[in-house]
Interface confidence: low
């Protein structure tokens, strides 16, 4: 087993966000297993009365893109490329600050679901988040 | 940023025991999977044992049977048992999450 490799997406769930580009698993296993995870929570979401629409626009991508982080092509090792930190922080405190508040109190949601933590990001002028990935979130001004 | 501080390592004799701790500055029940590597001295960085979120583990062969991965999501740290320890287990061991890393606790197997 590798510490790390690249393979292309094989998946269903997220498969409108990241087609077959290559991404970052920690195990042979991994996928199959974030895969199965992220059905589940997506199914969960499905009948959920709290998501508005607003925030699934950019949730829902932002979720696939921290589960199967594409790969970092400008490395020499395997590694994954991060969210970017500015728009983590709108989504988290502007376009889904009721949907996280909810998520992050339902233990049945965090089973399934890992939301990231905007904190654990580098920060936007780093060298570290040259490379993040961007959603598309509108900045607010 | 995430902070992961790992601690328990220390000089043991052989067949002798050692718990690694690894404790995170935030919650890391939201990682895909959390893990221990080592790196002895002029040696490459390895695979030690890594948890995933659901559960499953995986050890390296050289610990298989010897070493126990775990995690208290309620205490934000990941442990790490070693039984029947050998002087080639003697080594840094770091604690990792995705791209995060700690500083290393040094564990040594001597008589």
């Known amino acids: 087993e590798e510490d790390g490799f690249c393979q292309p997406y094989r998946g269903i769930a997220c498969a409108r966000f990241i087609g077959n580009r290559t991404v970052y698993m920690e195990s042979l296993h991994m996928q199959g297993e974030i895969e199965n995870q992220i059905t589940a929570a997506f199914t969960m979401i499905g009948t959920s009365s709290h998501l508005s629409d607003k925030c699934s626009q950019f949730a829902i991508p932002s979720l696939c893109h921290y589960a199967f982080p594409y790969c970092d092509e400008t490395s020499s090792v395997p590694k994954p490329r991060d969210l970017c930190r500015d728009e983590c922080e709108i989504l988290e405190n502007v376009l889904c600050q009721t949907e996280y508040i909810f998520a992050r109190s339902n233990p049945m949601i965090l089973m399934r679901l890992k939301l990231p933590n905007c904190e654990d990001l580098p920060q936007p002028e780093s060298p570290e988040a040259a490379n993040c990935i961007r959603i598309g979130i509108p900045m607010a001004d | 940023e995430v902070q992961l501080v790992e601690s328990g390592g220390g000089l043991v004799q052989p067949g002798g025991s050692l718990r690694l701790s690894c404790a995170a500055s935030?919650?890391?029940?939201?990682?895909?999977?959390i893990g221990w590597y080592r790196q002895a001295p002029g040696k490459q960085r390895e695979l030690v044992a890594r948890i995933s979120s659901m559960g499953r583990t995986y050890y390296a062969d050289s610990v298989k049977g010897r070493f126990t991965i775990s995690i208290d999501n309620s205490k934000n740290t990941l442990y790490l048992q070693m039984n029947s320890l050998r002087a080639e287990d003697t080594a840094v061991y770091y604690c990792?999450?995705?791209?995060?890393w700690g500083q290393g606790t040094l564990v040594t197997v001597s008589s």
């Open positions: 990792n999450a995705r791209n995060l």
């Open positions: 935030h919650s890391i029940s939201r990682f895909y999977a």
